[in-house]
Interface confidence: low
């Protein structure tokens, strides 16, 4: 398969595979290579609630309970991201593992990571049977952490 | 820059322009992709001790308290990783910001992260001037989280 | 402005118990601990304990345990110390604070508590 | 318990001049590079007021001629130059750890 920089892809390399394969074995495999979350998403109804459990995945035990929602796109590498959604607007207690403790807010951790969506060539002969990528900062929740209020102005 | 994709290289989309290119400046411009962690490092240092700020970054607001870890390889995609290192054991009090409380653990989320190492291509005329990307799995620890240690079997 | 208004004065049988209240305004009430602290007379100053009236989680000097609950009601902003089985050497005056960092930033105005036959 | 040992019991000092306070702890009172002992103030018929929280940050409101020093077990209240209202009961506080432990104080009076 015949690949090719586009210069009109922000420069970045580009793979401009025959449209024929569209979507051709290589490209699923490649986009499908991160699929899963870093905990995993079989456990995820654990945190559900304003809890922290004792047992289970860290985004169920963390007193910043999350869980995670997935968000796919086949033209995008990779095709899943999972976003982390905080269950608490606060701390739960490490007491209890259930009161929320009013002294710590449960925060999303941000992330620009980079992911490349599969754009049509410019500029190619044929253009109508080549894409290529092209690369793009994409923000993502990784995980929600509990954290002291900021000091108010 | 003609690309090919290397059957050698796990069966995913490889890119071998030139060695006379090397490191082409695509390649600099792409590999270089990700180069900061989820927070300013500028800000790391009041996180050197474990103790959770009233302000600053979450990482060292967070009650689990994490400085960064800069991982680079110039010969991967990303070129720059960064590895939270948690610097506390336990997690910070709330109310005091400084005191661990032993109710709770400070403990790494890791990743399975999506990566591309440029390796030399495989079967290919003239080898020694093209190079393929191998897709890897590669651990990195995001964050540092509080949670409730796990109940004792 | 941050208040903390304490209930008056307060003359008990040994063995009778008291229960003092200390009422906050001017800030977030469930968000900071209140911290009973308690000075006889010419003497100096003491902690009794502490309560984070957000979750009810209270901490309490293991001198006064068993003798003293504290409680709060967040609807009224109000902190409450209970001290049982009152002797003569509980005569003292009582304050709250407000606490952040375990001490004591704005105080009641004391609340004079005596423990006479 | 962390008992806190302050001296002297008490001191006289002529306005403008110097008054300096120590208190001194039974074992350390650090932790993770904060040092949990503070200052309070208190005058007859009055509860008592912060004046220096964590060793040496001064509390909002009060005069730069409050300061605070030391670590680990060795802290000291310095007062300078001492004014006439600085007539007052002093005391330290620990906070490093439970039960939260007083000084016997020091009382200050001018000459």
């Known amino acids: 398969v015949s690949l090719r920089i586009q210069e009109g892809c922000s420069h970045l390399p580009s793979c401009c595979p025959s449209k024929e394969q569209e979507p051709p074995e290589e490209w699923l495999k490649w986009s499908s290579a991160s699929v899963s979350p870093p905990e995993p998403l079989s456990h995820t109804h654990h945190a559900e609630s304003c809890r922290a459990s004792k047992d289970g995945p860290l985004n169920s035990r963390a007193i910043s309970p999350w869980s995670y929602e997935l968000d796919r796109d086949l033209n995008r590498v990779p095709q899943d991201l999972y976003h982390a959604r905080c269950l608490c607007p606060h701390c739960v207690s490490l007491q209890t593992g259930s009161h929320m403790d009013p002294l710590g807010n449960s925060v999303p951790l941000y992330h620009n990571q980079t992911v490349f969506y599969r754009r049509p060539c410019h500029g190619e002969e044929g253009t109508h049977r080549r894409y290529c990528l092209e690369r793009r900062l994409y923000r993502v929740s990784l995980a929600c952490v509990c954290v002291r209020p900021r000091v108010m102005a | 820059v003609s690309l090919r994709i290397q059957e050698g290289c796990s069966h995913l989309p490889s890119c071998c322009p030139s060695k006379e290119q090397e490191p082409p400046e695509e390649w600099l411009k792409w590999s270089s992709a990700s180069v900061s962690p989820p927070e300013p490092l500028s800000h790391t240092h009041h996180a050197e001790s474990c103790r959770a700020s009233k302000d600053g970054p979450l990482n060292s607001r967070a009650i689990s308290p994490w400085s960064y870890e800069l991982d680079r390889d110039l010969n991967r995609v990303p070129q720059d990783l960064y590895h939270a290192r948690c610097l506390c054991p336990h997690c910070v009090s709330l109310q005091t910001g400084s005191h661990m409380d032993p109710l709770g653990n400070s403990v790494p989320l890791y990743h399975n992260q999506t990566v591309f190492y440029r390796r030399p291509c495989h079967g290919e005329e003239g080898t020694h001037r093209r190079y393929c990307l191998e897709r890897r799995l590669y651990r990195v620890s995001l964050a540092c989280v509080c949670v409730r240690p796990r109940v004792m079997a | 402005q941050v208040q903390l208004v304490q209930s008056g004065a307060e003359v008990k049988k040994p063995g009778a118990s008291v229960k003092v209240s200390c009422k906050a305004s001017?800030?977030?009430?469930?968000?900071?601990?209140i911290e009973w602290v308690r000075q006889a007379p010419g003497q100096g100053l003491e902690w009794i304990g502490q309560?984070?009236?957000?979750?009810?989680?209270?901490n309490y000097n293991e001198k006064f345990k068993g003798r003293v609950t504290i409680t709060a009601d967040t609807s009224t902003s109000t902190v409450y110390m209970e001290l049982s089985s009152l002797r003569s050497e509980d005569t003292a005056v009582y304050y709250c604070?407000?606490?952040?960092?375990?001490?004591?930033?704005?105080w009641g105005q004391g609340t004079t508590v005596t423990v006479s036959s | 318990d962390i008992v806190l040992t302050q001296s002297p019991a008490s001191l006289a000092v002529s306005p403008g001049q110097r008054a300096t306070i120590t208190c001194r702890a039974s074992?350390?009172?650090?932790?993770?590079?904060?040092?949990?002992m503070h200052w309070y103030q208190q005058k007859p018929g009055q509860p008592p007021k912060l004046l220096i929280y964590?060793?040496?940050n001064l509390e909002s409101g009060v005069p730069a001629r409050f300061s605070g020093s030391g670590s680990g077990t060795d802290f000291t209240l310095t007062i300078n130059p001492v004014e006439a209202q600085d007539t007052a009961n002093y005391y330290c506080q620990q906070s490093n750890e439970d039960p939260l432990t007083f000084g016997a104080g020091t009382k200050l009076e001018l000459k």
């Open positions: 309560i984070l009236p957000g979750i009810g989680s209270t």
């Open positions: 964590r060793a040496s």
């Open positions: 604070a407000r606490g952040y960092g375990n001490y004591g930033d704005y």
């Open positions: 001017g800030y977030t009430f469930s968000s900071y601990w």
């Open positions: 074992e350390s009172v650090d932790s993770y590079g904060n040092s949990f």
